[in-house]
Interface confidence: low
Amino acid sequence: DAHKSEVAHRFKDLGEENFKALVLIAFAQYLQQCPFEDHVKLVNEVTEFAKTCVADESAENCDKSLHTLFGDKLCTVATLRETYGEMADCCAKQEPERNECFLQHKDDNPNLPRLVRPEVDVMCTAFHDNEETFLKKYLYEIARRHPYFYAPELLFFAKRYKAAFTECCQAADKAACLLPKLDELRDEGKASSAKQRLKCASLQKFGERAFKAWAVARLSQRFPKAEFAEVSKLVTDLTKVHTECCHGDLLECADDRADLAKYICENQDSISSKLKECCEKPLLEKSHCIAEVENDEMPADLPSLAADFVESKDVCKNYAEAKDVFLGMFLYEYARRHPDYSVVLLLRLAKTYETTLEKCCAAADPHECYAKVFDEFKPLVEEPQNLIKQNCELFEQLGEYKFQNALLVRYTKKVPQVSTPTLVEVSRNLGKVGSKCCKHPEAKRMPCAEDYLSVVLNQLCVLHEKTPVSDRVTKCCTESLVNRRPCFSALEVDETYVPKEFNAETFTFHADICTLSEKERQIKKQTALVELVKHKPKATKEQLKAVMDDFAAFVEKCCKADDKETCFAEEGKKLVAASQAALGL
């Protein structure tokens, strides 16, 4: 359904408030260093222009594409060259190359100051003073730090952010009301950003087919009663939504996501029995709820998979006639029967099945060749099961902090070239798998753990891609999306690594560590641990544990001292000397 004016169409569909919010998100995700006021000015100009097009779709420039309109607007920024360097060259290109160029310059780790939360009273005053600007700043700050954040979902976060301030700024104890809500939004936001980053990486690095395969598996687990044609339709629509959002087409994405939620709710009887509550909510809550909805119950008496995919004489005929449709059906049938498997495991099984058919359907006796294909699945299923069992046992034994430390040591030894902040961030997140997933019963552990690990390892991949330093990381990140985790798991100590020179400055601490939050103090200690392993990659667990225990005691002692700074200086020197001796540095 072609519209004379795309910008008028989206403005009318989304409404002014959502239109302005989405344009602000889009601009902040592209020009991540631009001041807030500059973005607001650009957004207001685009909004005024959109209103002229709503009034008269034939007005000048109203027929231009959104990329052309938005790109032209971004290219009016006076400081583009000095702020962004070569990104300014994008403006010399025509669409669609210009938009592609902007996309390529999105920075997953922008050099922006850490967001420091003001005092509650200060925030409440700012909120009451100018609610609209306050909420716009939230959108702007999140979007520029997370250039792939799922835009319609960010609108949902902003709605919750507003609700938190509306409620808590009137409460007797504002801080007790507000701070837990803001912490929850921050943690959920980081998780949401990382999940979406994986979807965009899947589409951009491995293509539509890879994303569709993921979606078939996940939606089949979630909606096992839906028939294959229904799942296929949802997959096609979901792929369009995410392709648009990952491609910077945020207005189209939000519009199409709303349409998809509407379709799902209108057809919930043929999709899932779990959607009723979601479908009674307002739009943003509805879409979020659908995305998080629990798996429906599996239909009773599902027949054996072997009949259609192994025993049938028509396997090769069906495969040859429509390869991807047949493989899609295999994935659908397998996934709906296995909510206990991770999506990546299901995709490995489908890949194994595909490889077997490719080989066997060209053989003299195809049926004889592929008859035992399901036997090949056994080791693929057991590998993550065993890994999760071992790591959950370790987590239960150590607790989260020490489990993170074990992973820090493990991953630093695997890929010591990776920057220390990246290793700390990724290993801390890997370690969170314990508290997130190990509490679940067996049937839910694997989908929780392995699919979460895929999200975290993608963070490592995108951060590493910006500044590649390790061939091993590049190899694990680029060879196969579904085998990233097994690839990293299989890495042993990097024997080619030349240990880092010892630098006492790295292990010098000051009294400011005493005023840090528990989390920030942990990060300081974990940073030191990574540096230790980089200096002494062959250090044993026992050696490292002894040094870290001494370090914790040293921090505790000096933070209790009257003259903290002197304590850190004098005791610190002793600690460094003792650690060097203990590790043979």
Partner: nanobody, 124 residues
Framework: DVQLVESGGGVVQPGGSLRLSCAAS????????MGWFRQAPGKEREFVSA????????YYADSVKGRFTISRDNSKNTVYLQLNSLRPEDTALYYC?????????????????WGQGTLVTVSS
């Protein structure tokens, strides 16, 4: 099955232009990723360009970036390849290909259906 028929090839001087077309029949065209490949005499078939179902993504081989443009018209079941600034090394048989799902890999095995090809000769 999808049938693909290419047209628009011919002889052209260096620096000249051509527009190749590929008409599809027998399937739902808008559900297929479309690609162009080429094979020069005595060489392997190589990827030239691809376009996603709804034209959101376009991909080009480095050797043709900035000179060739892929587009499609789903209402006409046709994909086009505009060839500008042609060079002698662009001489080849140009094939149109269709894939229901593609990983955006440049490998020809990703594509399920192929045309017979149209010959482009660049010579002075």
């Amino acid at each position: 099955d999808v049938q693909l028929v290419e047209s628009g090839g011919g002889v052209v001087q260096p620096g000249g232009s051509l527009r190749l077309s590929c008409a599809a029949s027998g399937g739902t065209f808008s559900t297929y990723v479309m690609g162009w490949f080429r094979q020069a005499p005595g060489k392997e078939r190589e990827f030239v360009s691809a376009i996603s179902q709804n034209s959101i993504h376009t991909y080009y081989a480095d050797s043709v970036k900035g000179r060739f443009t892929i587009s499609r018209d789903n209402s006409k079941n046709t994909v086009y390849l505009q060839l500008n600034s042609l060079r002698p090394e662009d001489t080849a048989l140009y094939y149109c290909a269709a894939s229901r799902f593609t990983s955006w890999y440049t490998a020809d095995y990703e594509y399920d259906y192929w045309g017979q090809g149209t010959l482009v000769t660049v010579s002075s």
